[in-house]
Interface confidence: low
């Protein structure tokens, strides 16, 4: 029972974690303008792995994708790769773990097979979580060391002059989402690995006792592993203008809410 609970909880925690990693990867707010260190510009810039956005005052967000691969910093490419690898491994891990769940019967699949699949998915979750944490940490380090190119139109083809004022960027919401999500995936993976040890057939457990000193036998008792981990558990490019005297054309061309931050 405890094994099933541990495995199930590990799966759920990993699922939440991987959803978080996907969300973080897609979010635009990896870096946001540090308002306190740079009060000069009236416009709020924020940047993600895939595009940068400008918030203007009359109610629009303008986001432009990074349309070049070659012009982007190698570290940004590395962060993208780490996050994608994390997502892919996590997704495969989830797929494997679904079939490995003790509560799901698939034909005459033996417990040893389920144990192996649980271990495999657990390792995948651990690596996935580590990839996400590494990716987010590398990006955070880029911000701390001012490696990140800070002008909003540097890679976005927005036109206009590049600001001479070096805008300071600080940690965006996506970094915190990524760290938490990576941590959850990692914890879920560890729980799956723990569950795996209790999933092995009973005779295997007792055989293991005979090969170890009696002091270690307690670790191999069937069902001897309990899981008691408690975890509490877009930027959208939307038109925000809500009315006013302007025509649609005027609104579109006017400085919008999202130019300022």
């Amino acid at each position: 029972m405890a094994v099933t609970a541990c495995q199930g909880l590990g799966f759920v925690v990993s699922l939440i974690g991987i959803a978080g990693i996907i969300a973080a990867t897609c979010m635009d707010q990896w870096s946001t303008q540090d308002l306190y260190n740079n009060p000069v510009t009236a416009v709020f810039n924020y940047q993600g792995l895939w595009r940068s956005c400008v918030r203007e005052s009359s109610g629009f967000t303008e986001c432009r994708g990074y349309f070049t691969l070659l012009g982007l910093p190698a570290m940004l490419q590395a962060v993208r790769a780490l996050m994608i690898v994390g997502i892919v491994l996590g997704a495969i891990g989830l797929l494997v773990s679904i079939f490995a769940l003790k509560c799901i019967r698939i034909g005459s699949m033996e417990d040893s097979a389920k144990a192996n699949m649980t271990l495999t998915s657990g390792i995948m979750f651990i690596v996935s979580g580590l990839c996400a944490i590494a990716g987010v940490s590398v990006f955070a380090n880029m911000l701390v060391t001012n490696f990140w190119m800070s002008t909003a139109n540097m890679y976005t083809g927005m036109g206009g002059m590049v600001q001479t004022v070096q805008t300071r960027y600080t940690f965006g919401a996506a970094l915190f989402v990524g760290w938490v999500a990576g941590g959850l995936t990692l914890i879920g993976g560890v729980m799956m690995c723990i569950a795996c040890r209790g999933l092995a057939p009973e005779e295997t457990n007792y055989k293991a006792v005979s090969y170890h000193a009696s002091g270690h036998s307690v670790a191999y008792k069937p069902g001897g592993f309990k899981a008691s981990t408690g975890f509490g558990s877009n930027t959208k490019n939307k038109k925000i203008y809500d009315g006013g005297a302007r025509t649609e054309d005027e609104v579109q061309s006017y400085p919008s809410k999202h130019d300022y931050v």
Partner: antibody
Amino acid sequence: QVQLQQSGPEVVRPGASVKMSCKGSGYTLNNFWMHWVKQRPGQGLEWIGMIDTSNGETRLNQIFKDKATLTVDKSSKTAYMQLSSLTSEDSAVYYCAPYGNFADWGQGTTLTVSS
Amino acid sequence: DVLLTQTPLSLPVSLGDQASISCRSSQSIVYGNGNTYLEWYLQKPGQSPKLLIYKVSSRFSGVPDRFSGSGSGTDFTLKITKVEAEDLGVYYCFQGSHVPFTFGSGTKLEIK
């Protein structure tokens, strides 16, 4: 028709605080910046700051950072500005204006600081 | 802070004449995205200011076409062709590119 209704004139003592309001109608007070502007009698316009009505985030002119506090109540579609430690220099008409282009200004709140 | 210098401070005109008001900024108010957030307002006696021109040259809805804005970088101009009585008041330029946003000192358009 988009309209902004500002609170009535205020007469206060030096050193006191005052909180003026700016109530919107004809649109949703959400997801834009509400600006506040000061105009002393017979003088020009001075930008105080702005508040993002979607999340309460503010940008203040440094001159007013210890003077003005901007807040918003989305449920009542009302933006507020509190002015503290008032002196005669704060006697002025205060305007609220949304959307960044200041197209739809309130009628202004006259503040008189007098002993 | 960006200083906006308006000239002249007072502009006496005859009805039907052309009026021109200059606004010069202490630094470029072209934002990084290429937009220049310079606006012109008219404040009539006892009234709130009203928007005339935004982004240098775009006329706001309902503003007569005798009002036009031009300029770039740091030098901007508001022109009123054939001044009418209803155009009298104080004109302000405003920049919304750099916090703190700033207004010009104002130009009073009056009858000669």
